[in-house]
């Protein structure tokens, strides 16, 4: 899996979308988990409704919501009031029994809100930033990591 980067601004909402084959994953519940470090296990944050037919209902865990369009094949996760410590590696998962298939690997990047710091003399100065086009709308900027940006083995 490539890793897709979703950029959000601190204090705002970030929406992450994970497309999937609706036929292949028919009848399966979905989950959103946070990976511990680059290679660590993925800890469940929130999962869709226990009844698959009700997967369209939004479920919350704290400030994180999940909803599944099972016909269209799109899992959507919303991180409300994004905070610095929300940054990290995540996965969208399709559940079957005790197993989980990875639908998408996601890097959530938390950027500074320039409006919070407009009076500060010694701090955040956004350079060219595609994510600051509109500081008040829910949005996400996504990009896939380039081929040259694959993990490389630790040096000995």
């Amino acid at each position: 899996h490539n890793t897709t980067v979703f950029q959000g601004v601190a204090g705002q909402s970030l929406q992450v979308s994970c497309p999937y084959d609706s036929m292949k994953h028919w009848g399966r519940r979905k989950a959103w988990c946070r990976q511990l470090g680059e290679k660590g296990p993925c800890q469940r944050v929130v999962s869709t409704h226990n009844l698959w037919l009700l997967s369209f209902l939004r479920r919350w865990n704290g400030s994180t919501a999940i909803t599944d369009d099972t016909l269209g094949g799109t899992l959507t996760i919303t991180l409300r009031n994004l905070q610095p410590h929300d940054a990290g590696l995540y996965q969208c998962q399709s559940l079957h029994g005790s197993e989980a298939d990875t639908l998408r690997k996601v890097l959530v990047e938390v950027l500074a809100d320039p409006l919070d710091h407009r009076d500060a003399g010694d701090l955040w100065f956004p350079g060219e930033s595609e994510s600051f086009e509109d500081a008040h709308v829910e949005h996400s900027i996504s990009r896939s990591l380039l081929e040259g940006e694959i993990p490389f083995p630790p040096t000995s």
Partner: antibody, heavy 120, light 106 residues
Framework: EVQLVESGGGLVQPGRSLKLSCAAS????????MAWVRQAPTKGLEWVAS????????YYRDSVKGRFTISRDNAKNTLYLQMDSLRSEDTATYYC?????????????WGQGTLVTVSS | NIQLTQSPSLLSASVGDRVTLSCKGS??????LAWYQQKLGEAPKLLIY???SLQTGIPSRFSGSGSGTDYTLTISSLHSEDLATYYC????????FGGGTKLELK
């Protein structure tokens, strides 16, 4: 093992330029926000500039804004700091610092630093 | 912008002592505070982030606490290798380091 190795420091005259590099290894460079932090001789730490994972978002402290440019090359796993119009008060050890995954808010690993001396 | 004041600037203590270092912000930091240790001639090392989260590999004798504008780093039992300068650092509004507290042997 995470490694950050700075290079490019040295003695430079006021008004001249210098470009620092930081070679990263032991982790997936493109996952992490990066920054430069400096420390003048016998003084405390001072944040200089930060850059997002893809390089599209850059942040600078007021005193270097318009003179310094932070950039990165994810294909080469390298962070840069282009320093122009250098002043004597820019004299310091410059540390390359790695943020956490997806952020530059705090710094989890630091290089050993490279000394920049601005003097005539 | 947020200023951080560390006290004392110099602290003398003995091995085995319980040591408390203070950091005060000029405005609310919302728990977005970290502590760094820097030994002479070395790069800083992250000890604690988000007020009280211990960085991986850091001994449990280090702990952090506080809220609002006032924060504390505690070393429960001082070891000789803990002698260093300690910096607090806030990331609630930009990036600001405190002036440091130098911890020396009494």
């Amino acid at each position: 093992e995470v490694q950050l190795v700075e290079s490019g420091g040295g003695l430079v005259q006021p008004g001249r330029s210098l470009k620092l590099s930081c070679a990263a290894s032991g982790f997936t460079f493109s996952y992490y926000g990066m920054a430069w932090v400096r420390q003048a001789p016998t003084k405390g730490l001072e944040w200089v500039a930060s850059i997002s994972t893809g390089g599209g978002n850059t942040y600078y402290r007021d005193s270097v804004k318009g003179r310094f440019t932070i950039s990165r090359d994810n294909a080469k796993n390298t962070l840069y700091l282009q320093m122009d119009s250098l002043r004597s008060e820019d004299t310091a050890t410059y540390y390359c610092a790695r943020g956490d995954i997806g952020t530059t808010y705090w710094f989890t690993y630091w290089g050993q630093g490279t000394l920049v001396t601005v003097s005539s | 912008n947020i200023q951080l004041t560390q006290s004392p600037s110099l602290l003398s203590a003995s091995v085995g002592d319980r040591v408390t270092l203070s950091c005060k912000g000029s405005q609310n930091i919302n728990n977005y505070l970290a502590w760094y240790q820097q030994k002479l001639g070395e790069a800083p090392k992250l000890l604690i982030y988000k007020t009280n989260s211990l960085q991986t590999g850091i001994p449990s004798r280090f702990s952090g606490s506080g809220s609002g504008t006032d924060y504390t780093l505690t070393i429960s039992s001082l070891h000789s290798e803990d002698l260093a300068t300690y910096y607090c650092y806030q990331y609630n509004n930009g990036w600001t380091f405190g002036g440091g507290t130098k911890l020396e042997l009494k």
